[in-house]
Structures are given as C-alpha cells and as structure tokens.
Interface confidence: low
C-alpha cells in the first residue's frame, strides 16, 4: 500500500534553517524506524555526494553551502514495492543563511506583551528582499514567510503574533531572501526576546526615601511581592531599557529587589515585573505605576530606559 500512511517522514536536525558553513542532518523515518533511504532535491542542483546514493539512517550535510539550499524529499527502502522504494516523504526545505546583510527586527508596540494581546514583529532592510522569514528559537518547523512590501527605499514585512501566550514568547530572528534564490536567506537579524506578561500577580513598587526627591539625592526603588519570584525587572514608561535584579527573601516572607537609581537626576514613571527562573519569558502583571519626580537637572545617570528598544539598538517605532 502506497497511501499517505505509508509515506516516510523526513526531518532536519537541529534545524532546517542552517548558517552557511554549518551542518544539518537529514533523517528519513519509515515504518517506525530509521532505515535506508534515497534523497531527492527539487531543483536538481548538482550535489555529487548524494546523486543515486543510498543512505543509512541519516545524511549529515557539512559544511553547508548555498548549493544545499532547497526542497528535499526522501524514499524509504520498501522491499515489497515494485520499485523497492516507498512513496515520497513530506518535503523539507533547507534554508541556508548568511548570504546577505542582516535585516532589522522590531516589536510594535514593544517586546513586553500582555497575555491575550497581539504584537507586530516588523522585519525590515534597505536590501530589496522579496520575502521575509520569521523564526522562533527552539522551533523546528519552517519559519513563517511573508512577501516584502517596498516603501521609501525600504523593504519590510509585519508578522502578527498572538493572542499572546507562553508558547509564543521567546527569542525571534528574521531573515530576508531575494527573488532568484528563495532558499538562500540573509544573515539573521539580531535576536529579539518577546516576553509575555500577566500570568502572575503584580508586585508592589515603592521608592526610598520617597517618590519626590531633590536633584542629586539618592533614590532606591524597591519591588516586592509575597510570590516567590526569582527575578525582578524595572522599566520606565516610554522606554525599553529595563534593569533586572535577583529577588531576595526578606524576614517578613516577601521577595524583594532594591534598584538603586543613584543620585536622582531623572524623573519618570516606573513599573516592575516579577519572573521565575524556570520561565524567563513569562513575567507578572506590572506593578502599579510609580511616578518619581525630581526637581533639578534633567540628565540621566543610569542607563536611560528610553533607548534602545530592540536587541540591535533600533528604535521601537515602525518604519
């Protein structure tokens, strides 16, 4: 029987998105085991090592070149079929990265996303990419693909992610490809961490000696909760730079972190979040906002939370 149930399953490990010079292993799983198989490549670009060759269990491509990029299928050994081989497997697309300059990846309105809400991840470049691909770290399935939109000398694509949940949080990268070589991707964008907020109770945020301070006076923001958070994150409204500190268990059974802002020079509205070590991309609801007001010099003495907003240092707003 050559029906759908009798097709082999072709997989790429560790990922089908491979840097040029890297390695990828193709495995053809057939009839509950890895056995002898033949590989087929859709575009028939000549890769001498596997033309007409029978592989045992797996095929390791290393070092990967642009010639390896393409759409693969396998056939498993099947002694009872007229040809001796099974029906073709599912296709696996090997995408080879590092062939163009990296694009930029931005989150709008920002990388901290409330549970149930949506975030737009925008990939953009001054290279006229025809397609953009979005890939989440640790996911083996094919990256999401969108056609690039060209405007004002920039090509871009907006990937909508959501409704937000823990499974969607993580580290994202995007890639671009040009028309004639759709499986040859750019270098990856700088990684962007998308964090889901809201599944845990909000911590409380307070200021010592108080939220109204004179310029030059030292101020410390304390984030605390009865929840046993491992880490606290302090952010300032209108900005993406956040500071994090490990939580310390206090005698009153609360878990607290004290953020010294140093001699106060810069007011603003602050919030803090709690998170657990086992789930770094999942943060609590934000604390109630705390307005710190400073009379005097407006310059900032600790890394300004207004800049930058993504891993590459790009501004958060969409282009």
């Amino acid at each position: 029987h050559m029906g759908g149930q009798d097709k082999p399953f072709l997989s790429a490990w560790p990922s089908a998105v491979v840097p040029r010079g890297g390695h990828v292993t193709l495995r053809c799983h057939y009839r509950h085991r890895f056995n002898n198989f033949m590989l087929y490549k859709e575009d028939r670009i000549h890769i001498p090592i596997f033309h007409g060759r029978i592989f045992q269990e797996s095929f390791n491509m290393s070092p990967v070149t642009t010639a390896h990029a393409g759409n693969y299928t396998c056939r498993g050994s099947h002694p009872h079929s007229p040809t001796g081989w099974s029906a073709p497997s599912n296709p696996v697309v090997i995408m080879v990265t590092g062939n163009h300059r990296k694009p930029s990846l931005l989150a709008h309105p920002g990388p901290l996303v409330k549970s149930g809400e949506r975030v737009i991840l925008q990939c953009w470049s001054d290279i006229m990419f025809e397609h953009f691909f979005l890939h989440k770290e640790g996911i083996s399935k094919d990256p999401s693909r969108l056609v690039g939109q060209i405007h004002d000398g920039v090509s871009k694509a907006n990937f909508s992610i959501g409704p937000m949940m823990l499974a969607l949080a993580g580290t994202y990268r995007c890639y671009g490809s040009v028309t004639h070589t759709p499986y040859q991707l750019s270098a990856p964008s700088d990684p962007l961490d998308i964090v889901v907020t809201g599944p845990y109770e909000k911590p409380s945020l307070s200021a010592q000696p108080g939220p109204k301070v004179q310029a030059g006076e030292s101020v410390t923001l304390s984030c605390s909760s009865r929840s046993s958070y491992d880490m606290y994150h302090l952010s300032r409204e209108g900005g993406a730079h956040e500071r994090r500190l490990p939580a310390v268990r206090k005698v009153n059974r609360t878990f607290q972190a004290d953020f010294p802002l140093g001699p106060a020079t810069h007011g603003g509205t602050y919030r803090c979040f709690g998170s657990f070590r086992h789930s770094p991309y999942e943060w609590s609801d934000p604390s109630d906002p705390l307005l710190v007001s400073v009379t005097g010099n407006p310059s900032s003495s600790w890394p300004s939370p207004t800049e930058p907003s993504s891993k590459s240092g790009n501004p958060r707003h969409l282009h």
Partner: antibody, heavy 123, light 106 residues
Framework: QVQLKESGPGLVAPSQSLSITCTVS????????VHWVRQPPGKGLEWLGV???????NYNSALMSRLSISKDNSKSQVFLKMNSLQNDDTAMYYC?????????????????WGQGTTLTVSS | DIQMTQSPSSLSASLGGKVTITCKAS??????IAWYQHKPGKGPRLLIH???TLQPGIPSRFSGSGSGRDYSFSISNLEPEDITTYYC????????FGGGTKLEIK
C-alpha cells in the same frame, strides 16, 4: 562597512573647553547609540558617556557636570563637549557604537570603534 | 559602580602557547562581559561578548568563560599578531573596563 572617525583640536589649554566630533558611516544614528571612551597615556580605558538612538544621554557620574554629548543625525555626526579641562584630561578619545545581543535588560557592548583622536591639555 | 579587576597586568608568553587572562567583578555581572584586543594607534577590537560568544571573523583560538563575578579569556596557539594589550568590559550596569593586560613575547 561600519566606520567611526574622531576629529578634535589636538591641543587645548587648561580650563578651556573641548569639542570632538565622531563621524560615522555604514549605520544610522537613528538606530544605534554612540559611546565615548578615553584612555590617558599609560592607563586603561574609561567610559565617558553615550547618546542613544533617540537622543537621550547617560554620563559617567564622576564627569557628568563637565560633559555634554549631542548629535546631528542628518550629518551622521556625534559631538563630545567637555569643559574646565585639566592636565589629567589628556588622553586618546574614542567613539564606539553600542550594540546588543539581548533585549532582556538591554545590555549593550561596543562592537565598532574609531581609531581615536589625541587630546593634550597643556599651556 | 561596578569595579573590574583584571589580572595579570602583564604576561610573557611563547608563540604557539596558550595564555589566560582573568577579570573579577565587584558584583555578579550576569555574564555581561566583553573582551577587546587593543593595538597601538588603533581602536579596540571586539573579540568576545556575553562571556563566550565569538564575534564574527574572530578565530576560534580566542575563547571566554565564566559566570557570577569571575571570568576568564584565553588565547591558544599564540601568533605574533596577538602580542598586544587586552581589556575586559562589564556591561551589566553601565560600563566599566578592566585595567588591561599587556601580552609580551617570552
């Protein structure tokens, strides 16, 4: 490719002010922060301050009262101004681009540097 | 402010050999340390960031490791062009450099 190039007066008298320009190419000042770092003769590197992509600044707290960093995005130029110069401000002054491999906590290292410009404070 | 204590301040080594430089932070810097090579008349060159991530184009002879407050940087199979000064940089909270290590030929 990414390049940064500093230009400055070379020699400044004590108590006077300093202005150094960093001209960048290969990236946009609206996308990356630029830091200033100096190295006095025979000593190590000291971080002075940064101007972020959006124009906000941070300064080394010990020098904050004497430092000012600004930029002109259209000209791809960043400016370091320092007043009340003393002999111990004699140093090689570098500009460097800030970049990061993490969003979480936005930790920024310096990935590209200029070749530096020498400043001597002397009468 | 975080202080970075880099040691040794100078180091004699043989070509083809291996050297290790250490940096100790005054507090936990969460692996946010970078290592730079600095040759006279040039700007520092980024070799490693986030403790052990090699910058593209940097040979694998260079490596870094560590956690908490203690970090190290090694060069194996030392080549003539490696003989210069090296700095660590913490970027966990603002930015602080170590005092530098000058590498010399034995």
């Amino acid at each position: 490719q990414v390049q940064l190039k500093e230009s400055g007066p070379g020699l400044v008298a004590p108590s006077q002010s300093l202005s150094i320009t960093c001209t960048v190419s290969g990236f946009s000042l609206t996308s990356f922060g630029v830091h200033w770092v100096r190295q006095p003769p025979g000593k190590g590197l000291e971080w002075l301050g940064v101007i972020w992509a959006g124009g906000s600044t941070n300064y080394n707290s010990a020098l904050m009262s004497r430092l000012s960093i600004s930029k002109d995005n259209s000209k791809s130029q960043v400016f370091l101004k320092m007043n009340s110069l003393q002999n111990d401000d004699t140093a090689m002054y570098y500009c460097a681009r800030g970049n990061s491999n993490h969003y979480v906590s936005s930790f920024y290292y310096f990935d590209y540097w200029g070749q530096g410009t020498t400043l001597t404070v002397s009468s | 402010d975080i202080q970075m204590t880099q040691s040794p301040s100078s180091l004699s080594a043989s070509l083809g050999g291996k050297v290790t430089i250490t940096c100790k932070a005054s507090q936990d810097i969460n692996k946010y340390i970078a290592w730079y090579q600095h040759k006279p008349g040039k700007g520092p060159r980024l070799l490693i960031h986030y403790t052990s991530t090699l910058q593209p184009g940097i040979p694998s002879r260079f490596s870094g490791s560590g956690s908490g407050r203690d970090y190290s940087f090694s060069i194996s199979n030392l080549e003539p062009e490696d003989i210069t000064t090296y700095y660590c940089l913490q970027y966990d909270n603002l930015w602080t450099f170590g005092g530098g290590t000058k590498l010399e030929i034995k």
